[in-house]
Interface confidence: medium
């Protein structure tokens, strides 16, 4: 139902949902710190522009009695309960930050008259695509899917001379929230990825995955999975792998590959890692001292959500426009704003664009090296290492189907 907004007369409030069920198991205190750091920057920027207004955040906590799984499984009702709480207290701000779970975001979007913008650090699933007042500040599944199709089709690079049209997808149901929705998108029969591939099979058991590694009758040489190197090792161990197997390991929110003195373990030699271009911005930040590389991205998304609101507030106030209007609610897209870590670009549907990086393990140096980058904003691949020292024959990626000639 319609809730009055605390969003006028020079006082602008941000409603931050602090849900027990979250895309990443992050202490709420860290997210509070991220929000507060963002508020300090926003206040300064507004003051700096000669706009003497007040900006605050209200943290809305659920009681945690009913919805306490800690992951996203019971988030649907928790999100609606929090919205009810906001409605009863008449405490809605100009913008809603959170939730991060796809289930809760989807349901909240359906069940509310969204005359206010909603900013999410997460909501990775395809069901949250193309929502007119939803902005997502962590790479959603659609962006991953577009990269994979683009990469599969590529056949004009020195290290990739075959188009691919097949894949196995390993999905055993224990994935983290981001991985769950990334793999869910690849599995969905109606998705762009499925539509563009001629063959795709989901492997759900560890043994299925392990058997494929040396199966002479396999239908594809390419296996997509999601997680970190340790996750792969638990599954693969030191098992022998056929020489033309390529494992694509999706591990977007993990900076560890770029840290100094990181050596790639031997079991990563058949693996291409897809991750995001790294950031070092939060290492010295007051709220990030105890964050792992993955959690840094999550906290940063909360901080950037505050900065995005500040950016839009500044524009509307400078133009003398009302904040509590559909125009404001629909404005959080197709723009670039100054995030904490540098410029942040949102596409036409309010989803963050980024530079994805595909890494390989150099057989010479045992280091992770950048093979190519991909700009999600323009859906374009940029080769970086034209002469990679691959484990694969002739330092080229193999065909996706054994024995098939050049495409």
């Amino acid at each position: 139902s319609q809730v009055s907004q605390n969003c006028h007369n020079g006082s602008y409030e941000i409603s931050v949902l602090m849900m027990g069920n979250s895309a990443f198991a992050e202490p709420l205190k860290n997210l509070e710190d991220a929000v507060n750091e963002g508020l300090e920057i926003v206040r300064g920027r507004l003051q700096n522009a000669g706009l003497n207004v007040t900006v605050n955040a209200t943290f809305m906590y659920s009681d945690g009695l009913i919805h306490n799984s800690g992951d996203c499984r019971s988030s649907t009702c928790e999100g609606l309960d929090l919205l009810r709480k906001i409605s009863n207290a008449q405490r809605m701000g100009c913008v809603l930050i959170g939730p991060s779970c796809t289930y809760s975001t989807f349901q909240m979007y359906l069940d509310t008259e969204l005359s206010y913008p909603m900013i999410s650090a997460g909501s990775f699933g395809l069901s949250c695509d193309y929502k007119e007042t939803l902005t997502r500040l962590m790479s959603p599944a659609r962006k991953l899917m577009y990269f994979l199709v683009n990469f599969w089709k590529t056949n004009d690079l020195p290290f990739k001379t075959y188009s691919w049209s097949t894949s196995y997808v390993y999905k055993n149901g224990t994935e983290t929230e981001d991985c769950f929705w990334y793999l869910n998108a690849l599995e969905a029969s109606v998705s762009y990825f499925s539509h563009e591939l001629g063959f795709k099979v989901v492997l759900r058991q560890d043994k299925e995955f392990q058997d494929i590694l040396m199966d002479h009758n396999r239908k594809s040489n390419v296996i997509i999975m999601c997680g970190g190197p340790e996750f792969l090792y638990k599954l693969k161990g030191d098992r022998a792998v056929a020489e033309d197997i390529v494992i694509i390991l999706v591990d977007l929110f993990n900076d560890q590959y770029f840290e100094d003195n990181v050596t790639a373990p031997d079991y990563m030699k058949n693996v291409l890692v897809l991750t995001l271009s790294p950031g070092n911005s939060l290492l010295n930040s007051s709220f990030s001292r105890n964050l792992s590389p993955t959690k840094r991205d999550f906290a940063l998304a909360y901080l950037n959500g505050i900065l995005l609101f500040g950016h839009m507030l500044k524009i509307f106030l400078e133009n003398g426009e009302n904040i509590t209007t559909p125009k404001f609610a629909h404005a959080f897209r197709n723009l670039t704003f100054e995030g904490y870590d540098g410029p942040v670009t949102l596409d036409d549907w309010g989803d963050v664009d980024s530079t994805m990086v595909l890494l390989y393990t150099s057989v010479d140096t045992k280091k992770y090296k950048v093979l190519l980058t991909y700009d999600t904003h323009v859906n374009k691949t940029y080769p970086v290492d034209m002469s990679p020292t691959f484990t694969w024959k002739n330092s080229k990626l193999p065909n996706d189907i054994t024995g098939r000639g050049p495409q």
Partner: antibody, heavy 119, light 107 residues
Framework: QVQLQQWGAGLLKPSETLSLTCAVF????????WSWIRQPPGKGLEWIGE???????NDNPSLKSRVTISVDTSKNQFALKLSSVTAADTAVYYC?????????????WGQGTLVTVSS | EIVMTQSPATLSVSPGERATLSCRAS??????LAWYQQKPGQAPRLLIY???TRATGIPARFSGSGSGTEFTLTIGSLQSEDFAVYYC?????????FGQGTNVEIK
């Protein structure tokens, strides 16, 4: 208390490359843009460009093809290189810090380095 | 690029008098404007940002006003240490740009 200390060659010949470094002491290095601004003798201030801890750069199109700005976060330093200098590049060069993150006005300045280009 | 124009180029004022300096932008900068003071041999010093907000430690005799394209810096009662060159600067867009300066000298 934040302090900016800058250094570099003061006398150059035409066509050489100007090279200046600015070190930041005290305060946070991340969370700010760090700028280079110059002032020819007896004239006004000209903004050259800026960089943040991540290496994101904004620079002045009038100098863009000759300017390189870089950052070394491990040393809390940033640097300016200006190639193919001429007498018109003779100026006092200042490094400066914004008042806050991405604010565009400058509350901390280096001491300035006079760079003279002469054959 | 936004061009900033200051007037007058030189302003002669007696100590204790009021000084009024003008700055005009070639297009709107809303209130994204700063004023600096510079003395010979020194780096500029930030006086005003946001068109009218005094920076930390700046005396109350300095005040800024204006928005859009027309701005004014007023020095209420000139002290001996106020004789210097004053610059305006816009930070609405890149590249940042400064005015050519107004020299406030003793009359």
């Amino acid at each position: 208390q934040v302090q900016l200390q800058q250094w570099g060659a003061g006398l150059l010949k035409p066509s050489e490359t100007l090279s200046l470094t600015c070190a930041v002491f005290g305060g946070s290095f991340s969370g700010y843009y760090w700028s280079w601004i110059r002032q020819p003798p007896g004239k006004g201030l000209e903004w050259i460009g800026e960089i943040n801890h991540r290496g994101n750069i904004n620079d002045n199109p009038s100098l863009k093809s000759r300017v390189t700005i870089s950052v070394d976060t491990s040393k809390n330093q940033f640097a300016l290189k200006l190639s193919s200098v001429t007498a018109a590049d003779t100026a006092v060069y200042y490094c400066a810090r914004e008042r806050g993150y991405s604010f565009g006005n400058y509350d901390h300045w280096g001491q300035g380095t006079l760079v003279t280009v002469s054959s | 690029e936004i061009v900033m124009t200051q007037s007058p180029a030189t302003l002669s004022v007696s100590p204790g008098e009021r000084a009024t300096l003008s700055c005009r932008a070639s297009q709107t900068v809303t209130r994204n404007l700063a004023w600096y003071q510079q003395k010979p041999g020194q780096a500029p010093r930030l006086l005003i940002y946001g068109a009218s907000t005094r920076a930390t430690g700046i005396p109350a005799r300095f005040s800024g006003s204006g928005s859009g394209t027309e701005f004014t810096l007023t020095i209420g009662s000139l002290q001996s240490e106020d004789f210097a060159v004053y610059y305006c600067q816009q930070y609405k867009s890149w590249p940042r740009s400064f005015g050519q300066g107004t020299n406030v000298e003793i009359k």
